[in-house]
C-alpha cells in the first residue's frame, strides 16, 4: 500500500490517505443510494480478515455495469497486489452466502472504519 500511486497525487500515497479515500467513497455510495444499488445485484460475502481487499475485489468485480461502484472497484484493484478477474474466487469468500451489493458495501465500510480507528492501515 505504501507504494500505491494514483490516489490523490502522482507519487506514492501514505496508506492512511488511501484507506481514508476508500472509506470516503464507500460513505458516498451509501449516502447517495436511491434505487437499489447495482440493480440489487448479489455478491459473495467475504471474511473481513487478512487478504480482505483482494477478496472484496474478487466479489465486486463480478458486478458489471454499475457506475456507482466503478471507483470502488478501481480503488480495491489498487489495494490488491495481484491481478483479479471476474469469476475468480479465493478461500476468503463465504461461498454459501450471497448478499446484496448495498449490504456488502455497508459491511466493508464498517470494517474499514474500525481498521482506520485502530490505525491498521496495511
Amino acid at each position: 500500500l505504501t507504494c500505491l500511486g494514483g490516489f490523490a497525487s502522482p507519487g506514492p500515497v501514505p496508506p492512511s490517505t488511501a484507506l481514508r479515500e476508500l472509506i470516503e467513497e464507500l460513505v458516498n455510495i451509501t449516502q447517495n443510494q436511491k434505487a437499489p444499488l447495482c440493480n440489487g445485484s448479489m455478491v459473495w460475502s467475504i471474511n473481513l480478515t487478512a487478504g480482505m481487499y483482494c477478496a472484496a475485489l474478487e466479489s465486486l468485480i463480478n458486478v458489471s455495469g454499475c457506475s456507482a461502484i466503478e471507483k470502488t472497484q478501481r480503488m480495491l484493484s489498487g489495494f490488491c497486489p495481484h491481478k483479479v478477474s471476474a469469476g475468480q474466487f479465493s478461500s476468503l469468500h463465504v461461498r454459501d452466502t450471497k448478499i446484496e451489493v448495498a449490504q456488502f458495501v455497508k459491511d466493508l465500510l464498517l470494517h474499514l472504519k474500525k481498521l482506520f480507528r485502530e490505525g491498521q492501515f496495511n
Epitope: G5, G6, P10, S64, G65, E70, Q73, R74
Partner: antibody, heavy 118, light 111 residues
Framework: QVQLKESGPGLVAPSQSLSITCTVS????????VNWVRQPPGKGLEWLGM???????DYNSALKSRLSISKDNSKSQVFLKMNSLQTDDTARYYC????????????WGQGTSVTVSS | NIVLTQSPASLAVSLGQRATISCRAS??????????MHWYQQKPGQPPKLLIY???NLESGVPARFSGSGSRADFTLTIDPVEADDAATYYC?????????FGGGTKLEIK
C-alpha cells in the same frame, strides 16, 4: 453467445434526426453497459456515449447537445438519437458492450451505415 | 479531453518480424495503480476487436504474440512475430476519464 445488432435508417437528410436501435442477446442490460461508437468512411473511431446497467448515461461532451441515449431493459434494446445531422455525421455506427471491470469494450455489433445526404 | 496520439500512422513489417505501435496520451491515464489503456484490432469491413486491456493484459483468446506495455502517458503495442493475419488497423483507447477517447489508428501492412 453474446450478440449486439444495430438497425438504422441508412439514409438521413441534412438537419434531420437519426435514430438507431441496438438489440442485444445473451446478456442483460441491467447488468451491462453499452457504448455507441462511430467511424466515418476511411477514418478512425469516435466514442459517442454510453449507458450503464444502472441507468447512468455518459456523453461525449463535444456532441452532448445533439445526443440522447436510452434503453428498454425488458426489450433488450438500447437507443441512440442524434439531432441536426450534417454530412460529416456520415459514418458506420456501432454499439459495443463493456466487459467486467476495467470496462473495455469486448463485444461489438457489426455496425449500421448511415449516410447524411439530400 | 484526453487526446491519444498514435505513431506511426502506418507501418510495413516483414512476416516474422516485430511490429511496434506507440500511443501517447495528453495526460496520464493511470489511476489507483492501473493504466486504463486498451488496444483494439480492426480489419476491413469488421468491427474492432479487443486485444489488450489495462495496458498489458491479454484478452481471452488473443494470441500471445500480442503484448502491451507502458504506464501514465506512454504505451506500446508489440506484435512479435508478425503473421499475415495481423494486417489491420490498431487503435488505443482510454477510459480513465470521460469522454472515452481513441487514438487515430495505426495501419499495419505485412510485407
Amino acid at each position: 453467445q453474446v450478440q449486439l445488432k444495430e438497425s438504422g435508417p441508412g439514409l438521413v437528410a441534412p438537419s434531420q434526426s437519426l435514430s438507431i436501435t441496438c438489440t442485444v442477446s445473451e446478456f442483460s442490460l441491467t447488468g451491462s453497459s453499452v457504448n455507441w461508437v462511430r467511424q466515418p468512411p476511411g477514418k478512425g473511431l469516435e466514442w459517442l456515449g454510453m449507458i450503464w446497467g444502472d441507468g447512468r448515461i455518459d456523453y461525449n461532451s463535444a456532441l452532448k447537445s445533439r445526443l440522447s441515449i436510452s434503453k428498454d431493459n425488458s426489450k433488450s434494446q438500447v437507443f441512440l438519437k442524434m439531432n441536426s445531422l450534417q454530412t460529416d455525421d456520415t459514418a458506420r455506427y456501432y454499439c459495443a458492450r463493456d466487459g467486467y471491470y476495467p470496462y473495455a469494450m469486448n463485444y461489438w455489433g457489426q455496425g449500421t451505415s448511415v449516410t447524411v445526404s439530400s | 479531453n484526453i487526446v491519444l496520439t498514435q505513431s506511426p500512422a502506418s507501418l510495413a513489417v516483414s512476416l516474422g518480424q516485430r511490429a511496434t505501435i506507440s500511443c501517447r496520451a495528453s495526460e496520464s491515464v493511470d489511476s489507483y495503480g492501473n493504466s486504463f489503456m486498451h488496444w483494439y484490432q480492426q480489419k476491413p469491413g469488421q468491427p474492432p476487436k479487443l486485444l489488450i486491456y489495462l495496458a498489458s493484459n491479454l484478452e481471452s483468446g488473443v494470441p500471445a504474440r500480442f503484448s502491451g506495455s507502458g504506464s501514465r502517458a506512454d504505451f506500446t503495442l508489440t506484435i512479435d512475430p508478425v503473421e499475415a493475419d495481423d494486417a489491420a488497423t490498431y487503435y488505443c483507447q482510454q477510459n480513465n476519464e470521460n469522454p472515452r477517447t481513441f487514438g487515430g489508428g495505426t495501419k499495419l501492412e505485412i510485407k
